[in-house]
Interface confidence: low
């Protein structure tokens, strides 16, 4: 037999919350358990599903879960079936709804002194209790002129008057929870004694010294009062006008007329209507003085033929918004065609050369009119007046290449040299007419030049080759003063270039011939062995047929190059002692000796008492200090050459003799002791 160990039982449940109907069976063989709701099998869903043999509810639903549930256990082999006791839910819920008009049938039928009934469509189980609100303030039962029927969820206003006007809402609460109306009801019951707007004043814009009219009307029973105020709350009446509103008139119908309006009259005007009962109604309107600013200037425009272009006219700031139109040759442009106005834009489609000229943008409003011209140029492709020609330019002189063109607008000319843009600097200058000036022609200026003349419509270009006529010159010019070492071989070069390869020869300045041990080999003066007699003035002469000759004078000095007889040695000196750095040099002319210490030249006139440079070139430093340490350089120089040699100077503390050392122990390094 099938036995129910646990049977489902009726229970309270909360709408939307979890619940479980328990069912457990015991049987000799396998059984399958299913559930019935009001006799129909229960299908599993995500919300309601079998959990073992129990039935689980993820969220109880008052509509889908109302009825009688039964647990059925069936042995499919024997056909035996057992059913549990019935179980149902007592589902607690509350659901919001709107506040609706129950009586009369429509809002149009609501009149003063009629009965008005409102219904609160909040429902629930157990039945909730209701609370009504007007404009957010609770209404309690038993107050005058209204009754609340909790059973029928109604609020009755008997009789309804203007004082009942407002926004009605309701809330309800029960053991399950609380809800408030999803949509509220606005009750509007007119009171004939309240002022109502018939005609409201509008903002006006007027030109200076024109007139302005504001209309304002209210209705009520008995008729309401009407008053006009200006910004500073000064009342405006025909009897008492503020000083700045002397020309104001208030008509019997409530309209306000202002004549010969001035800037001080601009501002906010308030029209106030007051009924016998109820609040005052304040209406506002603003008087604006019309104005128009100046228009911004247009940049001249350059367009190309065949293109489509637009010119936007930005309207000037103004009140009211200025209207804008374009004119050309005194005629207003149409809104369609080839040249036309579109919005604030001037549109030129498929531009022709004849479209060039002055176009005028006009803007106007009550305050006046403004205009601004734009000059439109239709660009043409440049044409040649004079192309650049292949030219021969003389080295060292200015050279000119023409590039004369004409077009509208004036064309821009740029020059290229070997395909590289020439930028103006100290050597190149492009004149306004396009001519290129090379200020001082150099040999490497001999190349291809190209000029390009451009306008927005297009460009033309031409090129020319420049050949540089080289001047006769020394390359490089010989040094005017040179030294040769006595009893050694020496060469003095001289080379030159010109339009034709020049011949080069040397001569002595006094005209005497060169000794046999001196040869002139293609411009190089060669001394097999320099003697004292070779000193003197020499002239290098370069010449060719077309350019004549040039001369360079050279003074040759014969010298015995410098050698050091005595060089300074690495020296270590006790602090406070005297250091001697010896240096002697020989040469012809007799060399002068200078010392450099710690990277600065030691000026004999500014050495101070501790340092001295002897006639023979030796440097002595008395009372040496640690800061005297460093490298000292002896520099020997004459008019022909210069040599240097250096040695370090170390200044050390005098050691204190240790007891173990005898009185005559030598120092551990080479010392100068004084």
């Amino acid at each position: 037999a099938i036995v129910f160990i646990k049977q489902p039982s009726s229970q309270d449940a909360l709408q939307g919350r979890r619940a479980l109907l328990r069912c457990e069976v015991e049987a000799p063989g396998p059984v399958h358990v299913y559930w019935l709701l009001d006799g129909a099998p229960v299908q599993d869903t995500e919300r309601r599903f079998a959990q073992g043999s129990s039935l689980s509810f993820a969220a109880v639903d008052r509509l889908q879960d109302s009825g009688t549930f039964q647990c059925v256990a069936r042995d499919d082999v024997t056909g035996e079936e057992a059913r549990s006791a019935n179980a149902s839910f007592n589902i607690k819920w509350i659901e919001a709804g709107p506040v609706v008009l129950k009586h009369p049938a429509s809002e149009a039928e609501i009149q003063p002194q009629t009965q008005v009934t409102l219904r609160c469509h909040i429902d629930g189980h157990p039945r909730p209790t209701y609370q009504w609100f007007r404009d957010g303030t609770p209404l309690s039962d038993g107050q005058s002129n209204h009754t609340v029927s909790s059973k029928e969820r109604n609020l009755t206003l008997r009789p309804a008057g203007p004082e009942h006007s407002g926004l009605y809402s309701c809330c309800a609460h029960s053991a399950f929870g609380q809800a408030c109306s999803s949509q509220n009801f606005t009750l509007s019951i007119a009171d004939e004694s309240f002022a109502r707007v018939v005609l409201a004043p509008q903002d006006v814009v007027v030109a200076r010294y024109e007139e302005a009219m504001f209309h304002c009307q209210f209705s009520a029973q008995p008729p309401p009062s009407l008053q006009w105020l200006f910004e500073d709350e000064t009342p405006i009446t025909n009897r008492s006008r503020p000083p700045h509103l002397r020309r104001a008139t208030v008509f019997a119908n409530g309209s306000l007329l202002l004549t010969q309006v001035r800037p001080r009259n601009a501002g906010i005007y308030r029209c106030i209507g007051q009924g016998q009962r109820g609040p005052p109604i304040i209406l506002e309107a603003t008087l604006h003085l019309a104005e128009i600013e100046d228009m911004p200037l247009f940049e001249p425009r350059v367009f190309t033929a065949g293109s489509e272009e637009r010119v936007t006219c930005l309207p000037p700031k103004g009140l009211p918004e200025p209207s804008v139109w374009w004119e050309h040759a005194g005629v207003r442009l149409p809104t369609h065609g080839r040249v036309y106005q579109k919005g604030h834009e001037l549109v030129l489609a498929n531009i022709a050369e004849s479209d060039a000229g002055v176009y005028t943008c006009h803007a106007a409003n009550l305050a006046g009119q403004r205009r601004q011209d734009v000059n439109i140029t239709v660009a043409t492709v440049p044409s040649w007046l004079k192309k650049p020609q292949d030219s021969q330019l003389e080295e060292g002189k200015p050279g000119y290449l023409d590039c004369l063109t004409q077009a509208t607008p004036k064309p821009t000319v740029v020059w290229y040299r070997n395909q590289m843009l020439i930028s103006e600097d100290s050597r190149f200058e492009v004149f306004k007419n396009g001519t290129l000036r090379i200020n001082s022609v150099e040999v490497y200026d001999g190349t291809w030049y190209r000029c390009m003349s451009s306008t927005p419509a297009g460009s033309i270009e031409a090129q020319a080759r420049v050949q540089v006529l080289e001047k006769l010159k020394f390359t490089p010019p010989p040094q005017p003063q040179q030294c040769m070492e006595f009893d050694k071989e020496a060469t003095v070069p001289c080379s030159a270039t010109g339009r034709e390869k020049p011949t080069i020869k040397w001569e002595r300045a006094d005209g005497s011939s060169l000794p046999e041990w001196v040869t002139d080999n293609a411009g190089t003066l060669h001394f097999a062995r320099v003697t004292r007699d070779d000193a003197g003035n020499y002239t290098c002469i370069a010449s060719n047929g077309p350019q004549g000759q040039i001369r360079a004078h050279v003074q040759l000095t014969v010298a015995v190059f410098i050698t050091f007889k005595v060089e300074p040695e690495r020296t270590t000196v006790y602090q406070g002692h005297t250091a001697l750095l010896q240096c002697e040099a020989q040469g012809d002319p007799k060399p002068l000796i200078q010392w450099k210490g710690k990277d600065r030249i030691l000026d004999p006139t500014k050495l101070g008492p501790r340092m001295h440079i002897f006639q023979n070139g030796s440097l002595v430093i008395h009372d040496v200090a640690p800061e005297d340490s460093g490298r000292y350089t002896c520099i020997a120089g004459n008019s022909c050459n210069i040599k240097h040699t250096e040695a370090p100077l170390y200044v050390v503390d005098k050691p204190v003799p240790e007891e173990s050392e005898g009185p005559g122990s030598p120092p551990p390094y080479k010392m100068i002791q004084t």
Epitope: Q419, M420, L421, S423, D425, R427, T447
Partner: antibody, heavy 120, light 111 residues
Framework: EVQLVESGGGLVQPGGSLRLSCTAS????????MSWVRQAPGKGLEWVGM???????YYASWAKGRFTISRDTSKNTVYLQMNSLRAEDTAVYFC??????????????WGQGTLVTVSS | EIVMTQSPSTLSASVGDRVIITCQAS??????LSWYQQKPGKAPKLLIY???KLATGVPSRFSGSGSGAEFTLTISSLQPDDFATYYC?????????????FGQGTKLTVL
């Protein structure tokens, strides 16, 4: 409005390639010399190369062989093709107009730059 | 290739100070030199061109001088907006080569 807008920057692995674009608006690229300039994070400006209106190209010595500048006048765009990228190529790359002759005409126009990061 | 050497690389100054930045080219470039100002995250802005000409919209307290290989940028009376990095730019062009070189920059900071 006359302006230059660079694009194509991003993260690339060492040894990889990237092509930057610089699109001009408000003027025609075909009539101007265009340069690429780069700036490594926290470092100074460094010229990469330029293309003249006759399509001649010039490069900084370090960029020769790896970087190529070209342009498509129909698209009003100049390009910088960067190959064999290294970590030290990480920089903001600017496209600039006229800087080669700014000393002469007193005007130069720059884009806002695009960041190239070379990292593994 | 040309090399542009700027000095100093950093410079601290106060509002109202007179500031001088120098730029040396490794070879003569005539007056083919411009000065640029750059603020963080922005593109450079042209200040001086042709070594000494003031670009449009640049205050007159900025001035440039020099030619050949030695150039200077002077700010006569430093303003708060002038704290930025300044670069010189040299241009060279010959028949076989052309190019541009920037100085390494001078960062101008508040003292």
């Amino acid at each position: 409005e006359v302006q230059l807008v660079e694009s194509g920057g991003g993260l690339v692995q060492p040894g990889g390639s990237l092509r930057l674009s610089c699109t001009a608006s408000g003027f025609s690229l075909s009539t101007y010399a265009m340069s690429w300039v780069r700036q490594a994070p926290g470092k100074g400006l460094e010229w990469v190369g330029m293309i003249y209106i006759n399509d001649n190209t010039y490069y900084a010595s370090w960029a020769k062989g790896r970087f190529t500048i070209s342009r498509d006048t129909s698209k009003n765009t100049v390009y910088l093709q960067m190959n064999s990228l290294r970590a030290e190529d990480t920089a903001v790359y600017f496209c600039a107009r006229d800087i080669g002759i700014s000393y002469y005409i007193g005007v130069s126009l720059w884009g806002q730059g695009t960041l190239v990061t070379v990292s593994s | 290739e040309i090399v542009m050497t700027q000095s100093p690389s950093t410079l601290s100054a106060s509002v109202g100070d007179r500031v001088i930045i120098t730029c040396q080219a490794s070879q003569s470039i005539g007056t083919r030199l411009s000065w640029y100002q750059q603020k963080p995250g922005k593109a450079p802005k042209l200040l001086i061109y042709g070594a000494s000409k003031l670009a449009t919209g640049v205050p007159s307290r900025f001035s440039g001088s020099g030619s050949g290989a030695e150039f200077t940028l002077t700010i006569s009376s430093l303003q708060p907006d002038d704290f930025a990095t300044y670069y010189c730019l040299g241009e060279y062009s010959y028949t076989t080569t052309a190019g541009i070189a920037f100085g390494q920059g001078t960062k101008l900071t508040v003292l």
